[in-house]
């Protein structure tokens, strides 16, 4: 059917059609993070809740060990929001002291890992300088886009600093994907 | 079909398939808000435009009295952006006066109401401290994710302060949902 | 099928069904911008990468000359993220000098152009005041929503200041659309 108008219905090719309710889908929500090792120059990956509350995985989309496993090749919409919170960033303290004020930052990366490829691929990045005047700050970073994924690909969410992630509510920090 | 590769086309099960153009969908846009009562500890819900300009509802997805009504059970992608604007937040004034500087904040919540359950469920929350140096500030909060909804569920968008919502343009503040 | 439950499968109407993998889709990523003319009171449009790296167009969704061309009428989900970065905004400099402090701002607009209609239509806008204390700042603006588009419509992304767009990484600044 690609690249042309639909033929008359008696010529219609039905084979690739599939029930929408049968497509791989997942919505994962934040959990308290347990300290884990991560490589020095690599942002740590978040753990997720996959079944409690609003979280679910279905139709062979499985979550295991920080990764969403892609069960079927196709185009997926992938999204995540991470809410960060912290005390006054060093930036403003440094500024008051008259030293050069390189701002702190918060970053979220949605990363794809393909076993046949040595390096992870960064699919989406949201990064923001944080140089707040107030003593306590909080803010979300939202990401979402469509990508062509292969069966066996793995998705994870990495953040610049796990200790700044707000894990208190499942509606504040989440990660999901669905086959289009 | 769930959990297995597609059988040859002559064995294909067609019953659950449905035309994509037939799925419930809505994109609502901001309107000027009329003052309405809301419970003391609950964020007020926004009114929306459902048919003028870019706004639409279709295929039994109806909008009524601040709510989007879910006409069919399934997995929906739900999204909203609210653009806030205000004068200098009290935070910076308080700070200048040497008082403790708890930051002001802006919050958007997409909430699900189920008649059979007494409490609304918060599906998505975007919350941000506002402690701006400039005298006039403005910024959007965007949310979007997938949820399993039941026929009869109702969706609304709540905000921390209706008076800060930018209602001037339909492209700045909006709310939508569609069945996947 | 609209507005009613599915009839028994032997009565099923198949004509409007179509393979999901056959739907128009595109994910475009940032490239370095070449200076181009734009009308004085109109935000400049971004150029995009359409085939290298994570970028793709498929199923008659084509990219040409800053525009995504819509090949088929229907409801599309459209999204974009633009990451901005800059030096200290004038806002804080003006403030220090005691002059009135109208904040600078950053804005992203997803615009629809219809040949039969003289004026472009702004579908989505994300706009944010920038009044940073730090000397270097960076932050994303994300947008996404569903719109009913017509065959022949063209989509573009406009920004308030091209020189502030971070074009260094394909995961930071992107633009996409897919038929639902």
């Amino acid at each position: 059917l690609k690249g042309q108008e639909f033929a008359p219905s008696h010529q219609q090719v039905y084979a690739p059609l599939r029930a929408d309710g049968d497509k791989p889908r997942a919505h994962l929500t934040v959990v308290r993070q347990t300290p884990t090792q991560h490589f020095k120059n690599q942002f740590p990956a978040l753990h997720w809740e996959h079944e409690l509350g609003l979280a679910f995985t279905k139709n062979r989309m499985n979550y295991t060990n920080k990764f969403l496993l892609i069960p079927e090749s196709g185009d997926y919409f992938i999204y995540s929001q991470v809410t960060f919170r912290g005390m006054t960033s060093e930036c403003s303290e440094i500024r008051q002291a008259g030293r050069p004020n390189k701002p702190d930052s918060i970053t979220v990366v949605i990363t794809k890992v393909t076993d046949s490829y040595p390096e992870p691929t960064q699919l989406l990045m949201g990064t923001k300088s944080v140089c707040e005047v107030g003593s306590n700050w909080f803010q979300p970073i939202y990401l979402g886009a469509m990508f062509s994924l292969q069966e066996g690909d793995k998705l994870m969410v990495n953040v610049s600093d796990i200790s700044l992630v707000d894990y208190t509510k499942e509606d504040k920090t989440f990660f999901g994907a669905f086959l289009l | 079909l769930k959990g297995q590769e597609f059988a040859p086309s002559h064995q294909q099960v067609y019953a659950p398939l449905r035309a994509d153009g037939d799925k419930p969908r809505a994109h609502l846009t901001v309107v000027r808000q009329t003052p309405t009562q809301h419970f003391k500890n609950q964020f007020p819900a926004l009114h929306w435009e459902h048919e003028l300009g870019l706004a639409f509802t279709k295929n039994r997805m109806n909008y009524t009295n601040k709510f989007l009504l879910i006409p069919e059970s399934g997995d929906y992608f739900i999204y909203s952006q609210v653009t806030f604007r205000g004068m200098t937040s009290e935070c910076s004034e308080i700070r200048q006066a040497g008082r403790p500087n708890k930051p002001d904040s802006i919050t958007v919540v997409i909430t699900k109401v189920t008649d059979s359950y007494p409490e609304p469920t918060q599906l998505l929350m975007g919350t941000k401290s506002v402690c701006e140096v400039g005298s006039n500030w403005f910024q959007p909060i965007y949310l979007g994710a997938m949820f399993s909804l039941q026929e009869g569920d109702k969706l609304m968008v709540n905000v921390s302060d209706i008076s800060l919502v930018d209602y001037t343009k339909e492209d700045k503040t909006f709310f939508g949902a569609f069945l996947l | 099928l609209k507005g009613q439950e599915f009839a028994p499968s032997h009565q099923q109407v198949y004509a409007p069904l179509r393979a999901d993998g056959d739907k128009p889709r595109a994910h475009l990523t940032v490239v370095r911008q070449t200076p181009t003319q734009h009308f004085k009171n109109q935000f400049p449009a971004l150029h995009w990468e359409h085939e290298l790296g994570l970028a793709f167009t498929k199923n008659r969704m084509n990219y040409t000359n800053k525009f995504l061309l819509i090949p088929e009428s229907g409801d599309y989900f459209i999204y974009s993220q633009v990451t901005f970065r800059g030096m200290t905004s004038e806002c804080s400099e003006i403030r220090q000098a005691g002059r009135p402090n109208k904040p600078d701002s950053i804005t992203v607009v997803i615009t629809k152009v219809t040949d039969s209609y003289p004026e472009p239509t702004q579908l989505l806008m994300g706009t944010k005041s920038v009044c940073e204390v730090g000397s270097n700042w960076f932050q994303p603006i994300y947008l996404g929503a569903m719109f009913s588009l017509q065959e022949g419509d063209k989509l573009m992304v406009n920004v308030s200041d091209i020189s502030l767009v971070d074009y260094t990484k394909e995961d930071k600044t992107f633009f996409g659309a897919f038929l639902l």
């Epitope: 929500t29 959990v31 308290r32 993070q33 347990t34 753990h47 997720w48 809740e49 079944e51 409690l52 509350g53 609003l54 295991t64 060990n65 920080k66 894990y167 208190t168 509510k169 499942e170 509606d171 | 359950y117 409490e119 469920t121 918060q122 599906l123 | -």
Partner: antibody, heavy 123, light 107 residues
Framework: QVQLQQSGPGLVKPSQTLSLTCAIS??????????WNWIRQSPSRGLEWLGR?????????DYAVSVKSRITINPDTSRNQFSLQLNSVTPEDTAVYYC?????????????WGQGTLVTVSS | DIQMTQSPSSLSASVGDRVTITCRAS??????LNWYQQKPGKAPELLIY???SLQSGVPSRFSGSGSGTDFTLTISSLQPEDFASYFC?????????FGQGTKLEIK
């Protein structure tokens, strides 16, 4: 440290309702990082998970299919405890009943457990 | 539902022995596997969580390994206080499920 203290009768008549309570100290029944569970142990069935209550965006309950029609688990935020009610009991419900916190932090596990209550169903 | 099959159901060993207990799941779930020790008249106590992480206060002679469907609990050198029953448990999906237990007895 977190402790769970169980209370409730050890003898219940057939067709009546088994009721147990689990008092929590050192944590909150409303914690978003825990679920609050009832588990029973008998020689015939081994360790059998019965159900749980927990709060995320709202209070949620999940129950084992084997007891779903008869079980209720309720949180009591004012007393920081949770309870088990099992209706229409039969002698097959005779077991040691435990309450347990499941820590939810990516991985999840039961810790701590209550001291256990031997419930005998007999007339 | 995920079924957990533990083996052996009972085991006789001596102080100082190295002992291995295995647990097999009916479907794969990576590392969502916990091990508990239970002494007579007492509640189970957590030994190992997430397949291989040692619970605070548990002696280092206990270790866990495995991923997917096959998991192992090893006691490197049995001590008198280790004679008890041991249970595996999956925490990946609801309902939670346990192995039927391994009773470790003195030879």
């Amino acid at each position: 440290q977190v402790q769970l203290q169980q209370s409730g009768p050890g003898l219940v008549k057939p067709s009546q309702t088994l009721s147990l309570t689990c008092a929590i100290s050192g944590d909150s029944v409303s914690s978003s990082s825990a679920t609050w569970n009832w588990i029973r142990q008998s020689p015939s069935r081994g360790l059998e998970w019965l159900g749980r209550t927990y709060q995320r965006s709202k209070w949620n309950n999940d129950y084992a299919v084997s007891v779903k029609s008869r079980i209720t688990i309720n949180p009591d935020t004012s007393r920081n405890q949770f309870s088990l009610q099992l209706n229409s009991v039969t002698p097959e419900d005779t077991a040691v009943y435990y309450c347990a916190r499941e820590v939810v932090a990516g991985p999840r596990w039961f810790d701590p457990w209550g001291q256990g209550t031997l419930v005998t169903v007999s007339s | 539902d995920i079924q957990m099959t533990q083996s052996p159901s009972s085991l006789s060993a001596s102080v100082g022995d190295r002992v291995t207990i295995t647990c097999r799941a009916s479907q794969s779930f990576s590392s969502y596997l916990n091990w508990y020790q239970q002494k007579p008249g007492k509640a189970p106590e957590l030994l190992i969580y997430a397949a291989s992480s040692l619970q605070s206060g548990v002696p280092s002679r206990f270790s866990g390994s495995g991923s997917g469907t096959d998991f192992t609990l090893t006691i490197s050198s049995l001590q008198p206080e280790d004679f008890a029953s041991y249970f595996c448990q999956q925490s990946y999906s609801t309902p939670r499920s346990f192995g039927q237990g391994t009773k470790l007895e003195i030879k």
